[in-house]
Amino acid sequence: APTSSSTKKTQLQLEHLLLDLQMILNGINNYKNPKLTRMLTFKFYMPKKATELKHLQCLEEELKPLEEVLNLAQSKNFHLRPRDLISNINVIVLELKGSETTFMCEYADETATIVEFLNRWITFCQSIISTLT
């Protein structure tokens, strides 16, 4: 059974992940239309279901494509280089989802834009945090 300290740690990690994702979304939304238009040409894949921490596997698998889009915007609106930002997110995701069980991510048929993708994972973080508090 999860202890209060492990729950608190999970909550803090989720809050950290949430802040990183929100920072990326804010950075993207700051772009003038021409750049945003280019970023929106990238297709992202969404999980069929995202209700548990193990479903973060689906986020982990899309981090490299996310880094590619952020490379388009590398110097403008982010404090960190895309590689470092994604590396930080990857560390949190790996800790949160755990490595004990191998979960095969199932993806929805429809693709999403970067904005929809980030919003989906922001909602996921908020939802899990609310169950922990």
Partner: antibody, heavy 121, light 113 residues
């Protein structure tokens, strides 16, 4: 049709700089990134970096960071690659390239004819 | 950076015979969401720029003869020329286009035996 036409061959002294141009036609230069790839004589291909002509955003390979400058002039549909502090190992053919119509960044589908830069004292 | 290892360095094949070139990446190039491998193959003849043959490991570029085919997934990939023609003499390179910086293999020289 898409065409990338590069400037002519250059001979440079060690320590100097070279600026190679790449004129795009057959599409709007602001719609795609322009990449630069080099190839030393008898050697393989090495990606140097890209520029987004839309806003001048650049992304350089770590190896060339600080020595290469990519720029673009949208009014003439021309991209430029400037390499400074030249040394003999920089002797190579320099290519500009563009991605496929259907892919935002890679792979490189359209290439310039190449510009030979020779660095010799 | 992702390291691309190509083999063999050179290959001599008789006209009309099959030529096979291998490429191995240091990390998986498979994107789970779309099941695509971000690997391309190029042909380069002397004095010419590289020519895109195949991308996403197995998608032929428009106008490329169908004797050229690509296969493989994850970290192991193959370019096959089913029936070698004289005009296929060239150096062939693989390229990973999954993550920046894109990286090329060292090349495989294909000659007529």
């Amino acid at each position: 049709q898409v065409q990338l036409v590069q400037s002519g061959a250059e001979v440079k002294k060690p320590g100097s700089s070279v600026k190679v141009s790449c004129k795009a036609s057959g599409y709007s230069i602001t719609d795609y990134l322009i990449h630069w790839v080099r190839q030393a004589p008898g050697q393989g291909l090495e990606w140097m970096g890209w520029i987004d002509p839309e806003d001048g955003e650049t992304n350089y390979a770590q190896k060339f960071q600080g020595r290469v400058t990519l720029t673009a002039d949208t009014s003439t549909s021309t991209a430029y690659m400037e390499l400074s502090s030249l040394r003999s190992e920089d002797t190579a053919v320099y290519y500009c390239a563009r991605s496929l119509d259907s892919t935002p960044i890679y792979p490189f589908a359209y290439w310039g004819q190449g510009t030979l830069v020779t660095v010799s004292s | 950076d992702i390291v691309m290892t190509q083999s063999p360095d050179s290959l001599a094949v008789s006209l009309g015979e099959r030529a096979t070139i291998n490429c191995k990446s240091s990390q998986s190039l498979l994107r789970s969401g779309n099941q695509k491998n971000y690997l391309a193959w190029y042909q380069q003849k002397p004095g010419q720029p590289p020519k895109l043959l195949i991308y996403y490991a197995s998608t032929g570029q428009s106008g490329v003869p169908d004797r050229f085919s690509g296969s493989g997934s994850g970290t192991d990939f193959t370019l096959t020329i089913s029936s070698l023609q004289a005009e296929d003499v060239a150096v062939y390179y693989c390229l990973q286009h999954y993550i920046t910086p894109p990286t090329f293999g060292a090349g495989t020289k294909v000659e007529i035996k």
